[in-house]
């Protein structure tokens, strides 16, 4: 278990317990219960109160991070009396030993890298381990391939993202023979950490008066449809003076992605490149390879 649990309770205890794997808080059921309530308070005094489970003697916290330490609390009224119990959930271990600067990104639609740095006060023999649970909590993914620095795990590569959902819980545990290592946890949205590939199949066709650029939306990990994409086209006249403004054009995603612009013959040599983003986040991909059109003597 990643942390010590300390109970603060009156004489007749509810025996409150917390399972960090399932994020389930449970207590001993009381006869003739008329009211039950559970909640947690974090270090910033934010209160999270989930719905009670059907049996009313447990509740499950969905979207919480625990590494800063939290206090769980259960209130139960029966027809005879009231119960109240607190459960302290500290992040035990030496301060500053937890993994830090944790981040993850999804790329190439089906690969993910997570990286972190060793805690500043972590001993030389520290070892970190990454576990990922999806929002449905049905499955725990253990890191299959660690990235190492002098033998210490400082990153993880995943090439199978089938166990992830739209929001996932990441836990970095630590071990050492010398001292207790604190854990770090984080909730990440896949839509916020995905880096799109640039659009594919970029083509340019010109007639005497116009040029038509076409492209295909990038393959993504997220389930996105055509309206979920925003594109930016960089149409660039070659051999222009340095400092000349590029023409950046914003285009909304469509079933057939195309941009038609006036360009009469004879036309100078131009290049066009395109990048893509989620329309809600505008986290731009890298640019596609530049496609050239027109002629040097235009």
């Amino acid at each position: 278990e990643k942390s010590d649990l300390r109970t603060v309770a009156p004489a007749s205890s509810l025996n409150v317990r917390f399972d960090s794997r399932t994020m389930n808080l449970s207590w001993d059921c009381q006869e003739n219960t008329t009211f039950s309530k559970c909640f947690l308070t974090d270090k910033k005094n934010r209160v999270v109160e989930p719905r009670l489970s059907n049996n009313e003697c447990s509740c499950t916290f969905r979207e919480i991070c625990l590494h800063e330490g939290v206090t769980f609390e259960v209130h139960v009224n029966t027809s005879q009396r009231g119960f109240q119990q607190k459960l302290l959930y500290p992040n035990s271990g030496r301060e500053g030993t937890a993994a830090q600067n944790f981040s993850c990104f999804i790329y190439n639609a089906d690969l993910m890298n997570c990286t972190w740095a060793r805690g500043p006060t972590a001993p030389r023999d520290v070892q970190y381990f990454l576990y990922i649970r999806n929002s449905k909590r049905r499955r725990e993914i253990r890191c299959p391939y660690y990235i190492q620095d002098s033998g210490t795990h400082v990153g993880c590569h995943l090439d199978n993202l089938s166990g992830l959902t739209s929001r996932n819980y990441f836990l970095v545990n630590g071990t050492s023979r010398e001292i207790g290592i604190q854990f770090f946890d984080s909730l990440l949205d896949t839509k916020k950490i995905e880096r799109f590939n640039p659009p594919s199949n970029v083509t340019v066709r010109c007639n005497t008066t116009h040029c038509l650029v076409r492209w295909k939306q990038p393959r993504t990990y997220q389930k996105l449809s055509y309206l979920d994409f925003q594109y930016q086209l960089d149409v660039h006249r070659k051999n222009t003076q340095p400092g000349t403004e590029n023409l950046l054009i914003n285009v909304s995603g469509d079933l057939e992605n195309r941009y038609n612009f006036p360009s009469s013959e004879p036309r100078a040599k131009h290049s066009v490149k395109i990048r893509a983003a989620d329309v809600r986040i505008l986290n731009w991909s890298s640019w596609s390879e530049a496609i050239e059109f027109g002629s040097d003597d235009g």
């Epitope: 739209s166 389930k223 996105l224 055509y226 309206l227 079933l255 057939e256």
Partner: antibody, heavy 120, light 111 residues
Framework: QVQLVQSGAEVKKPGASVKVSCKIS????????IHWVRQTPTKGFEWMGG????????VYAQRFQGRVTMTEDTSIDTAYLTLSSLRSDDTAVYYC?????????????WGKGTMVTVSS | QAVLTQPSSVSGAPGQRVTISCTGS?????????VSWYQQLPGTAPKLLIY???KRPSGVPDRFSASKSGTSASLAITGLQADDEADYYC???????????FGGGTKVTVL
Amino acid sequence: QVQLVQSGAEVKKPGASVKVSCKISGHSLSELSIHWVRQTPTKGFEWMGGFDPEENEIVYAQRFQGRVTMTEDTSIDTAYLTLSSLRSDDTAVYYCAIVGSFSPPAYRPWGKGTMVTVSS
Amino acid sequence: QAVLTQPSSVSGAPGQRVTISCTGSGSNIGAPYDVSWYQQLPGTAPKLLIYHNNKRPSGVPDRFSASKSGTSASLAITGLQADDEADYYCQSYDSSLSGSVFGGGTKVTVL
């Protein structure tokens, strides 16, 4: 230009079944999610179901569960809606639509609609 | 009874600005799920005007705009024109029904 061409109007007796088709032209059905929505003067628009890429399967609205079947023939880019045990309050215009954006779905474009009349 | 509540009608003179409200609950708009808006001209299929609360698909004039706050959303039409006369519907997703839900529609009349 992507178009959704729906089958013609139908008149059915209570208890019967109806099958409405939706042919996609200008794009491959295998790259799209199709949903079905019906419209009545009394109840307005009612979502019936469609392909959910998260679940990788066709999902149905609870109120139509057991009576509705949605199928796709990607070889001819056609989606089908079958509604059984028809009642008079199933009289409606039935639309197929492409999911243009997920979470939650936004529909664009729509077919022109198929009028289904249930009458004894 | 529609899950999302809209006024049955609004009207305005040409050139004016009209707004249409759409009120939901904590299981749909307030969950929070995004809102889409559609225009339906008489005898035709609906046309998407707005998605992801405030995004316009290509081809939709910027006279149409929308916003969302809490459990409600609104659509604004500025510079009202005669061909804006139509029914307008809001749509979102409802977690308790596990599917798309619609408003009852608002008839916009250009005076």
